[in-house]
Interface confidence: low
């Protein structure tokens, strides 16, 4: 008995060939001996089976002695043994129809689980192997689960169902809903405008939901909601914004926030959450703000940074074109009685300057100038 595997929703063509290369009498039946279709001269006739409107043949092939049964929009319950009766002989074909579906939706939030469920006909014992877009292989039986979906899991998953040494391949497009970056850090001098961008790592036709930016300032004992907004068909509208600081928000995607100025009391880290319509859970992106201030008070030149800096970051004060006068893995450095000239405060990581602030120290009878 020949075995043919089909995919739910697809079309399958079961072949039946006569020895004579001409149009002769044939008919297809199911295992209950119910006629599905056949011919009467050059006409196609259909029987009373449940396949009625989904069954067809190719009349153009009859003259060559080929009498295929075409079943459209396959269902799991179409799995059966089909019998072609032609020239006093019977050809049996076992059709097994499988379906592979994602648990709820093919659009899943980062960190959520993907469950693929195999629908199979009674009596079958298939094995399934899926390959993710990043090349990860998972194997299983009726269900396969992948926990903690990552951004790289977005794309086409290719799953192979194996039964009776035959295989059928499914392709499922999974969209992992996430921000492009899990975390970002912005370095700014005091007073500078700060731009925060939250690009999404996916595109969908309609995007609706709501979001909020919570901010934990380094100086504050508790976090505070800085802004809440709605997203409707990719249009952003602000619902509520604190008055200090007053963030401005772009009206289109990508989500874009502007802090009018970087101030020490704003330095810290924020968490932007985005809840999408008809989705449980939220998208998250962490954003960090580091603020630098260089000041001269009397005979003390000080450089300070606020915000989440790593212990390996170096803070230095140097006179332009000279060696660093002071360099420490601390958040504040200072020089007593600095000589006149343009001083640079540098925040660097392994030699790479992340943030720089210049302050002009005038001869002792003048006041400092901050460019």
């Amino acid at each position: 008995k020949k075995v043919v595997l089909g995919k739910k929703g697809d079309t399958v063509e079961l072949t039946c060939t006569a020895s004579q290369k001409k149009s002769i009498q044939f008919h297809w039946k199911n295992s209950n001996q119910i006629k599905i279709l056949g011919n009467q001269g050059s006409f196609l006739t259909k029987g009373p089976s449940k396949l009625n409107d989904r069954a067809d043949s190719r009349r153009s092939l009859w003259d060559q002695g080929n009498f295929p049964l075409i079943i459209k929009n396959l269902k799991i319950e179409d799995s059966d043994t089909y019998i072609c009766e032609v020239e006093d002989q019977k050809e049996e074909v076992q059709l097994l129809v499988f379906g592979l579906t994602a648990n709820s939706d093919t659009h899943l939030l980062q960190g959520q689980s993907l469950t693929l469920t195999l629908e199979s006909p009674p009596g079958s014992s298939p094995s399934v192997q899926c390959r993710s877009p990043r090349g990860k292989n998972i194997q299983g039986g009726k269900t396969l689960s992948v926990s903690q979906l990552e951004l790289q899991d977005s794309g086409t998953w290719t799953c192979t169902v194996l039964q009776n040494q035959k295989k059928v391949e499914f392709k499922i497009d999974i969209v992992v809903l996430a921000f492009q970056k899990a975390s970002s850090i912005v370095y700014k001098k005091e007073g500078e405008q700060v731009e925060f961008s939250f690009p999404l790592a996916f595109t969908v036709e309609k995007l609706t939901g709501s979001g909020e930016l919570w901010w934990q300032a380094e100086r504050a004992s508790s976090s505070k909601s800085w802004i809440t907004f709605d997203l409707k068909n990719k249009e952003v509208s602000v619902k509520r914004v604190t008055q200090d600081p007053k963030l401005q928000m772009g009206k289109k995607l990508p989500l874009h926030l502007t802090l009018p100025q970087a101030l020490p009391q704003y330095a810290g880290s924020g968490n932007l959450t985005l809840a999408l319509e008809a989705k449980t859970g939220k998208l998250h992106q962490e954003v960090n703000l580091v603020v630098m201030r260089a000041t001269q008070l009397q005979k003390n030149l000080t450089c300070e940074v606020w915000g989440p800096t790593s212990p390996k970051l170096m803070l230095s004060l140097k006179l332009e074109n000279k060696e660093a006068k002071v360099s420490k893995r601390e958040k504040a450095v200072w020089v007593l009685n600095p000589e006149a000239g343009m001083w640079q405060c540098l925040l660097s990581d392994s030699g790479q300057v992340l943030l720089e602030s210049n302050i002009k120290v005038l001869p002792t009878w003048s006041t400092p100038v901050q460019p």
């Epitope: 007073g191 509520r240 008055q243 200090d244 100025q261």
Partner: antibody
């Protein structure tokens, strides 16, 4: 302690402009927004707008945005408000105000004493 | 804009009694458990003075006879017991939405 010292009263003619000041002391001027509030004689309070002295960014009440222009001078710790094309409707006391810290950061905790502007021919 | 309606417009209360001032907002000023409503006192020829912030928090240096309550759209300022120096105009102000807006004021007279 935080103090906001405003300039003295102004008597101006209709159609003219006036510029008043608000000098801040007792805190880092560039760390906080300066707000301006209008109060007509015997009337309530109306928020005009605000300025971030650090960056110069300003925001206005849409109903009053063509009337006022807000500026700030970091070197003198002073915020300014200029009112243009004055009419009798602009005769009022104008206050500068600063919000508080921590819990009261969305309330006007500090106020200037007010500048009286009288528009009269 | 959010409209704040204060009542009564004026109020006369005997010394030592309770003064109650109401403020109704045209839409909720609550968000995430907080009410963004503040109360100010203004005496003639002086700037307003912050009494209560976030609906019920007493500003530093303000006597405990002042108290605020309410949430959503209905807020109340209570003064008990009223003292001579409390004669003034009282304003509510919302800070949840720009532009921030003030109520029309309630004038308190001490009998």
């Amino acid at each position: 302690q935080v103090q906001l010292q405003q300039s003295g009263p102004e008597l101006v003619k209709p159609g003219a402009s006036v510029k008043m000041s608000c000098k801040a002391s007792g805190y880092t001027f560039t760390d906080y927004v300066i707000n301006w509030v209008k109060q007509r004689t015997g009337q309530g309070l109306e928020w005009i707008g605000e300025i971030y002295p650090g960056s110069g960014s300003d925001y206005y009440n849409e109903n009053l945005k063509d009337k006022a222009t807000l500026t700030a001078d970091k070197s003198s710790n002073t915020a300014y408000m200029q009112l243009s094309s004055l009419t009798s409707e602009d005769s009022a006391v104008y206050f500068c105000a600063r919000k508080g810290e921590n819990g009261n950061s969305l309330a006007f905790a500090y106020w200037g004493q007010g500048t009286l502007v009288t528009v009269s021919a | 804009d959010i409209v704040l309606t204060q009542s009564p417009a004026s109020l006369a209360v005997s010394l030592g009694q309770r003064a109650t001032i109401s403020c109704k907002a045209s839409q909720s000023v609550d968000y995430d458990g907080d009410s963004y409503m503040n109360w100010y006192q203004q005496k003639s020829g002086q700037p307003p003075k912050l009494l209560i912030y976030a609906a019920s928090n007493l500003e530093s240096g303000i006597p405990a006879r002042f108290s605020g309550s309410g949430s959503g759209t209905d807020f109340t300022l209570n003064i008990h017991p009223v003292e001579e120096e409390d004669a003034a105009t009282y304003y509510c102000q919302q800070s949840i939405q720009d532009p921030c807006t003030f109520g029309g004021g309630t004038e308190l007279e001490i009998k």
